[in-house]
């Protein structure tokens, strides 16, 4: 028998520095977690103790903090090289800055293979990107070899900016011939490493003949066997065992997100490459693990540029940006409109001639807007200003909801109106009218939404049975501020870009902004 140790990360999202327990900015260092310096300590410790170790990343290193905003992926290549990752799969967020923003900083600089079997380049891009990412890579590990085959969410064109010269194929259809090829090349130990979410990971384990282990990402799934060490609630045991269609037991793993845990899986193979046993657990990277001094020194060196960036002007406002709780928790506020407009703008994807865009709607809890921005400072807007407005380090995500769920969400928005509570929704692509004289749960008297399947966008009444795409904060997607109906009833959830980054990019693009209060949210009394 031959034993392999798989160390894995996924959805690190630019958390190069240690973070607080909830993966936001580290405040009290003695209680902080994760970060590449601490990760390196643990990885090195395992590499020294065990003979056959692979360090893999399942995508979405890009996007999430000011590190990505400033360094645009160069930081990913640099620190992943320093940690000596063995392979990485492309995630949807790796395309956030377009294909060029992937090729130059990451694909050309990475000293490890970057993989995806279901992304096919065409046209002029095919020769430009050839060999920079691969469908699979065979890695020597001790006296054996292991094949790693990559995959990426086929929803990426709707979630990011891969352009028109990359085709995202069905994962299972694309993986099977690559695995067949590896098997025929005498590779009898094969890991599928990819970024399509836990449901697809399980399907790959079930359907793709010859895959021995699946290491996934995208859904931020936390798996654990035994008592979990922090706040995350396990979605299942680690590893999660899937019985394949040909009767094999295939371990599937994922390691939550944000570099908080290091996935640790031990696999035992027989001489023909069959999995005999698998066990492990994610390792919580808490403060009991010291940060590696040399990586930490490098982080501090790279950090200097971030501090300078946060005070630079992104753009100007010529109006007061009202982000006060007195406004945003009670009525339409122009800061809410600005943020929602930025959220929609960030999700412009012309992927179908029938649709002007795939999504037109935004909702945003008023309680998530934490500060106004005064225009009387020469109109200057900095990253620092935006960090005061959006201090939680969240993301603006894409969900699919039924109209009936949206109606419930808007009822919840005003169910206890007047108490300055955070659930009051700011909107984009939505016209809502409330009648507060009616009883809670029955206060939405008009709810019109902007069409997407139209050449001239216009507002139509919400249909209860129709499925709509909506951009919203991850906080709401996870049921925050009492929006349990969103969490319980959402049909799809894809995590998006860092909130501040979305707004800062929009302001930089617009150069001068002047958002108004324009009647998106209205109040009425009497019959409708």
């Amino acid at each position: 028998a031959w034993e392999l140790t798989i160390l894995h990360t996924n959805d690190v999202h630019s958390r190069l520095e240690q973070t607080s327990e909830d993966s936001s900015k580290c405040v009290n260092a003695s209680r902080c977690m994760g970060g590449v310096a601490r990760l390196f300590t643990k990885v090195q410790q395992i590499r020294r103790a065990e003979p056959n170790v692979l360090l893999l990343d399942a995508g979405d290193q890009y996007q999430g903090t000011i590190w990505f905003t400033v360094y645009k992926g160069a930081e990913v290549a640099h620190f992943m090289n320093a940690l000596r990752y063995d392979a990485m799969a492309l995630g949807n967020h790796e395309f956030d800055n377009g294909v060029e923003g992937l090729i130059e900083p990451l694909l050309k600089e990475a000293k490890f293979p970057i993989l995806s079997a279901n992304i096919k380049a065409k046209g002029p891009l095919a020769s430009q990107i050839s060999g920079l990412y691969l469908p699979y890579k065979v890695l020597p590990v001790g006296d054996e070899v292991v094949g790693i085959v990559g995959y990426t969410s086929k929803e990426t064109p709707f979630l990011s900016n891969p352009g028109t010269n990359l085709v995202f194929e069905d994962e299972i259809t694309a993986l099977q011939p690559e695995v067949d090829k590896l098997k025929t090349l005498n590779v009898n130990k094969i890991i599928a490493l990819g970024h399509s979410g836990f449901e697809m990971d399980k399907l790959i384990a079930q359907k793709v003949r010859g895959v021995d282990v699946v290491v996934g990402g995208h859904s931020n799934t936390f798996l654990y066997t035994g008592n979990p060490p922090s706040k995350e609630v396990p979605a299942g045991k680690y590893p999660f065992i899937v019985t394949s269609d040909d009767g094999r037991k295939v371990p599937v793993v994922q390691a939550y997100a944000f570099g908080k845990y290091l996935g640790y899986l031990k696999i035992e193979f027989d001489e023909r490459g069959n999995v005999i046993s698998s066990h492990g657990n994610p390792i919580l990277l808490n403060s009991s693990i010291p940060e590696d001094p040399s990586i930490k020194a490098d982080i501090n060196k790279w950090r200097i540029k971030l501090d300078n960036y946060s005070t630079q002007e992104l753009g100007k406002t010529i109006v007061y940006l009202d982000g006060s709780s007195q406004s945003c928790r009670f009525r339409e506020c122009n800061m809410g409109n600005l943020i929602c407009d930025a959220m929609i703008n960030n999700n412009l994807r012309h992927t179908d001639e029938m649709f002007w865009n795939h999504v037109s709607m935004c909702i945003l809890n008023g309680g998530g807007i934490r500060s106004p921005i005064d225009e009387r400072n020469n109109g200057t807007i900095t990253w620092e200003n935006l960090a005061a407005v959006l201090p939680f380090g969240g993301t603006f995500d894409l969900v699919q909801l039924k109209g009936s769920t949206l109606k419930k969400a808007f009822e919840h928005s005003v169910h206890r109106y007047g108490q300055s509570t955070g659930e009051f929704l700011q909107v984009g692509g939505i016209h809502v009218v409330y009648d507060l004289s009616r009883k809670p749960g029955d206060r939405v008297v008009k709810l019109d939404v902007l069409c997407t399947k139209c050449r001239v966008p216009s507002y139509d009444p919400l249909k209860m049975d129709e499925v709509y795409k909506v951009i919203l904060p991850n906080f709401l997607a996870n049921g925050g501020d009492g929006f349990q109906m969103i969490k319980d009833e959402l049909l799809r959830h894809d995590s998006g870009d860092q909130d501040i980054n979305v707004v800062s990019t929009y302001i930089s693009k617009m150069k001068v902004i002047y958002p108004a209060v324009e009647g998106r949210i209205k109040f009425s009394t009497g019959s409708h």
């Epitope: 060999g131 070899v145 067949d180 090349l185 005498n186 590779v187 023909r272």
Partner: antibody, heavy 120, light 107 residues
């Protein structure tokens, strides 16, 4: 003794067919991917085709794709190469070779070869 | 397809000489290269696999090195039985390809 023995070669007219066989002995045949490699007179080696241990996955050189078919019968420890629509440029010594037990494929056992001459 | 270019195409050497043959791949093939020796009228014989691993039963005067795109076969002290043609072969991807061969002749 580990051995591969090809047969079935000969002289054939262009456009006709020929079937080569390779009998394996001295090892567990169904544990190995098997290959055909050819060598035109006075020329270098050219890989022709592979079939995996189970006989499911097959890959071919572009020069023979659509004309040649590789197959195996694990119960008889025998590898085959069905060659259709033969051309003059298919004239060569055809070797069957074992693909080794491990990656990377390295042909660790070769047969003695069988000569195929395509001529009118 | 991955092309393999061998050089030189032929080399004249004497018994006891050190002989070096190179093989260059058209793209990165990691360490997935093998070397063969072939004598006239005979089947090829495997010498080196995975760029540097010596096949069982092959004399230790044969050695291989390299990774990525550049590879070398070295015969440290040429013996009379070593006069033959040598081929490199990649197994990184299908189609499997061979180099054009290097003929080692007696000076």
């Amino acid at each position: 003794e580990v051995q591969l023995l090809e047969s079935g070669g000969g002289v054939v007219q262009p456009g006709r067919s020929l079937r080569l066989s390779c009998a394996a002995s001295g090892f567990t045949f169904n544990f190995y991917g098997m290959h055909w490699v050819r060598q035109a007179p006075g020329k270098g080696l050219e890989w022709v085709a592979v079939i995996n241990d189970e006989g499911i996955n097959k890959y071919y050189a572009d020069s023979v794709k659509g004309r040649f078919t590789i197959s195996r019968d694990n119960s008889k420890n025998t590898l085959y190469l069905q060659m259709n629509s033969l051309r003059a440029e298919d004239t060569a010594v055809y070797y069957c070779a074992r693909g080794g037990a491990r990656y990377p494929i390295a042909f660790d056992i070769w047969g003695q070869g069988t000569m195929v001459t395509v001529s009118s | 397809d991955i092309q393999l270019t061998q050089s030189p195409s032929s080399v004249s050497a004497s018994v006891g000489d050190r002989v070096t043959i190179t093989c260059r791949a058209s793209q990165d093939i990691s360490s997935w290269l093998a070397w063969y020796q072939q004598k006239p009228g005979k089947a090829p014989k495997l010498l080196i696999y995975a760029a540097s691993s010596l096949q069982s039963g092959v004399p230790s005067r044969f050695s291989g090195s390299g990774s990525g795109t550049d590879f070398t076969l070295t015969i440290s002290s040429l013996q009379p039985e070593d006069f033959a043609t040598y081929y490199c072969q990649q197994a990184n991807d299908f189609p499997i390809t061979f180099g054009g061969g290097t003929k080692v002749e007696i000076k």
